[in-house]
Interface confidence: medium
Amino acid sequence: HPICEVSKVASHLEVNCDKRNLTALPPDLPKDTTILHLSENLLYTFSLATLMPYTRLTQLNLDRCELTKLQVDGTLPVLGTLDLSHNQLQSLPLLGQTLPALTVLDVSFNRLTSLPLGALRGLGELQELYLKGNELKTLPPGLLTPTPKLEKLSLANNNLTELPAGLLNGLENLDTLLLQENSLYTIPKGFFGSHLLPFAFLHGNPWLCNCEILYFRRWLQDNAENVYVWKQGVDVKAMTSNVASVQCDNSDKFPVYKYPGKGCPTLGDEGDTDLYDYYPEEDTEGDKVRATRTVVKFPTKAHTTPWGLFYSWSTASLDSQMPSSLHPTQESTKEQTTFPPRWTPNFTLHMESITFSKTPKSTTEPTPSPTTSEPVPEPAPNMTTLEPTPSPTTPEPTSEPAPSPTTPEPTSEPAPSPTTPEPTSEPAPSPTTPEPTPIPTIATSPTILVSATSLITPKSTFLTTTKPVSLLESTKKTIPELDQPPKLRGVLQGHLESSRNDPFLHPDFCCLLPL
């Protein structure tokens, strides 16, 4: 051929037209061309229809061609690989109808700022998708639904700040995920699903270490040997895993997998995400309960006492173990008080007046003071119905989970909790007038009701707040029957789900510290 090099290897006819200053497809290329290289030309725009005569074309390289537009018309029925990298495309062409057999699509280093929901529709054979080095900020939730055979996905070096929770749903063959060098601050719960992901690249993101990160932390712990640092030019299989490369941005580059997360509810591990419940692992010494460790659980119903200490906090960061460097959108709160003010390790708390009634009592609740939101049992956010459940029942007692095995195993997503947990012995009766209370918005600070046993000797009991403690003595709610040793229990008020989508508001309800 006068312009391009033609070579035949086995059954492949390869035509190399790289670096020829071409502005269009050269004429008279061999009709049985299977691999066509058009890299580093000045095509600017290109129509795939011009390639329709080449019915055996399986690979097309259009990288570094200053492409601003790719016209998709006609059909290239056997084209398997399309390289569009290092161009100037601002939108991803809808390739599904034109390239039904496509298995590898590389659109790295273009100028994509967003992808439409149906961007990959019709690409059911796609196995590798490379979108590295674009300007993507978000992704549509069902983006990868049409590509169930996907094995490799690169979203590295974009401006992604968040990922849709179900992005990887159904991608059972996915073995490599490149998310490094983005602006991700958290990974949504359940994001990785239950299938094994052998190669994950997650470094170079400003991970915000607070309670919202716990699902991701747990996944990192269980998949430590599958987390790698990207090295240009090194084969993935030759790289060494490095889970410590995933670091907290707000805490001195602390590895996320070691983030202590003290006082957080077990968002990463538990199905119920409605209320706090504290179950200390106990050593009994006479009539004292010595709390040595705390596992934080979520029952689906409230249980509180006729006596209560209320306190609330602002929505700024309460991640008090790392107060010195906050996320850019978070503000530092100056006022911090411990709760109770002098509650320190090995302090014995005597509260003679507190009694736990063995029989549940149903009492109406007085109107709370304007500064606090009314305590209302909220539904667990992962339930299908989101209506408030006005009748509290006694949750099933939960003991501390068994330690995880040392060998990591895929973390399967827990099944959604039933609407009503199995009651122990007697359920508490419904209030006389069950009226669903409007769910507070983000503007309302969450409020916590904490009740205590008559005698607790905690090893460590810090509760950090950012507003002064206030005591609402008249507050009453039902007490479920206690069939276990006395425990410190707490109820989180305020609608957890309402701020779940705002990562800078919701995560900071976390910082009740462990016993």
């Epitope: 712990q221 070691k258 003290k262 077990t266 705390t294 330690p403 995880s404 460590s460 462990p514």
Partner: nanobody, 121 residues
């Protein structure tokens, strides 16, 4: 039984130094990350520093970076915190804390009783 016993606290003038120690027993010290945390009077709990199992990786809160050094001696089952250029805002009870035994639990696993550090002229 797991025990963490801090020592080395005391009264020191601004700009002075202290070295805190934490003697650990009842668990395989060399298998756990260890942490120093502190609580200033009337303030919340603040994470100060952390060290990995072998001592090769150390982490510090911004407020102490460049002034404090965490280290460990796995042969002696002891954790240390060298505090230099102390400021009045470093006044607090300092606790050493053991890492989690597994990923199902959350929070520091065990704490010492704390040692008081007072920086005052």
């Amino acid at each position: 039984e797991v025990q963490l016993v801090e020592s080395g606290g005391g009264l020191v003038q601004p700009g002075g130094s202290l070295r805190l120690s934490c003697a650990a027993s009842g668990f395989t010290f060399s298998s756990y990350w260890m942490y120093w945390v502190r609580q200033a009077p009337g303030k919340g709990l603040e994470w100060v520093s952390a060290i990995n199992t072998g001592g090769g990786s150390t982490y510090y809160a911004d407020s102490v970076k460049g002034r404090f050094t965490i280290s460990r001696d796995n042969a002696k089952n002891t954790l240390y915190l060298q505090m230099n250029s102390l400021k009045s805002e470093d006044t607090a009870v300092y606790y050493c804390a053991k890492d989690l035994p597994n990923s199902d639990s959350l929070g520091y696993d065990y704490w010492g009783q704390g040692t008081q550090v007072t920086v005052s002229s």
